[in-house]
Interface confidence: low
Amino acid sequence: CRTSECCFQDPPYPDADSGSASGPRDLRCYRISSDRYECSWQYEGPTAGVSHFLRCCLSSGRCCYFAAGSATRLQFSDQAGVSVLYTVTLWVESWARNQTEKSPEVTLQLYNSVKYEPPLGDIKVSKLAGQLRMEWETPDNQVGAEVQFRHRTPSSPWKLGDCGPQDDDTESCLCPLEMNVAQEFQLRRRQLGSQGSSWSKWSSPVCVPPENPPQPQVRFSVEQLGQDGRRRLTLKEQPTQLELPEGCQGLAPGTEVTYRLQLHMLSCPCKAKATRTLHLGKMPYLSGAAYNVAVISSNQFGPGLNQTWHIPADTHTEPVALNISVGTNGTTMYWPARAQSMTYCIEWQPVGQDGGLATCSLTAPQDPDPAGMATYSWSRESGAMGQEKCYYITIFASAHPEKLTLWSTVLSTYHFGGNASAAGTPHHVSVKNHSLDSVSVDWAPSLLSTCPGVLKEYVVRCRDEDSKQVSEHPVQPTETQVTLSGLRAGVAYTVQVRADTAWLRGVWSQPQRFSIEVQVSD
């Protein structure tokens, strides 16, 4: 037989269907020009050594075959001996490993069988009343089609569905939408109203995310605050990737889940902008402030649930970086300036109170003074840090205060407000005999000791009331007791204690009189 003709002889292999699960399937035949026809099919299974034969039976009962060799597509003309106007029955027989495998048959009128294309190009996916709506442009000159879809999830096989008849320049299909798993869809078309017309190939996969994007499961860690007053937020665990059906693995446009990082800077509420949204891949540097961090997942159907963390403020303090001078007009703070034209945010709150009670003040952009210092002043009338209690102060700086991720911590420290020298005076000073020439002096801790780093030392003063001689004894801020020795019996002494800060000398406590009894021997 000539290769261009259908061979009306017995095929060159035994006629026995193996009943194997593999083999040829999805046979499609159609007219491709005025006088030429094409049949194509799929072959499932190992392809080595397989020969395919296209079988054709005419309505007269005569049958013939085309030898296709290893190809799974074959063209013939209307001169090949095959009836094109009467219906013919076609199937493929594949001869492999000494056995024959047969495809299902198709019966059609070749001349009226037009090759239909699957949806080509962009298939638009949207959500409509809890269902999935797909829409695409009808391929050229192919208005009037039946459309089917098939869909699968990562864990389920293909399921077939019907889109119904289409008769317009655009075609559409309503499909089921899964809540929590991604789906792969494929569509195919065939000529409407043409008896036995072949289905097109399946379209390229359309990958659809679940209605609800997966909740992000991530963990963060925050590095130590660096010298520049910033600390890096790092992602310890990447968000779990959505499991995808087979045809969507690799590049699957449509199923992408975008994770965004929403930062909310809790400290320094008087600044212009408190929140910023970033891509999760771009991990920011943060100041030492307290933040709330949310990771928001979203897909093409919108945002999903988010996961929120609290990043506590860095409470590492720099006791010597801040100078505070209290004058008659008010109080001024000095600290090493960061750079030119910096905006500073000074935040303070009473120690031991909820973080929500922080107060803050934003300075205008300022340059360093000649000594390289930045300053902030307030009057007594403003009431700022006016109460005699311990305040926690943090100063933040930014050259771009409107950009949340460009703030840095300048310093954090404690400050005792109000009249610290008077308020810090130690009370309950008591004297106990210790030996024949020494006494033990005790006092209640100064209020300043509640303020870490503020109390520099206690000073105990002892005055000999006879000679008016005065001795002063420095005492560590953690101690509230000292032994005074070298005292003389029968002499009157007064003792006083004061509490000093780094920048203020305290007020002496009320004088406490005592003397050591003269010991009379029998």
Epitope: T3, S4, R36, A67, G69, S70, A71, R73, L74, Q75
Partner: nanobody
Framework: EVQLMESGGGVVQVGGSLRLSCAAS????????VGWFSQAPGQDREFVGA????????DYKDSVKGRFTISKDNPKNTVFLQMDSLKPEDTAVYYC????????????????WGQGTQVTVSS
């Protein structure tokens, strides 16, 4: 990707013979049909003949049957077009191409063309 290279063309007297070669590199020819086409000046590319490489099945256009023979050398991954009893109307550039479509005579069904070799039949 398979690349094809034709050779063996030349000038020959009427009634003479030539043997053209089509050598493939970058892939095997086993899963292809190798077709020979001729293109005379100002004309479309026209099917001459083809061979299914895996089974050796050949196909020729009527006007060359009995004069032209297509064969292959499996180890060399090469197909030959033996041209005998040449006529002036056989003068053309000859190209080889690959297809997986059995019975394909349309150049549009072929891919991976070579650059061609000139055959001139002089009287």
């Amino acid at each position: 990707e398979v690349q094809l290279m034709e050779s063996g063309g030349g000038v020959v007297q009427v009634g003479g013979s030539l043997r053209l070669s089509c050598a493939a590199s970058g892939g095997t020819l086993y899963s292809y049909i190798v077709g020979w086409f001729s293109q005379a000046p100002g004309q479309d590319r026209e099917f001459v003949g083809a061979i299914e490489y895996s089974g050796g099945i050949t196909d020729y256009k009527d006007s060359v049957k009995g004069r032209f023979t297509i064969s292959k050398d499996n180890p060399k991954n090469t197909v030959f077009l033996q041209m005998d009893s040449l006529k002036p109307e056989d003068t053309a550039v000859y190209y080889c191409g690959l297809t997986r479509v059995v019975g394909a005579r349309n150049p549009g069904d072929y891919a991976y063309w070579g650059q061609g070799t000139q055959v001139t039949v002089s009287s």
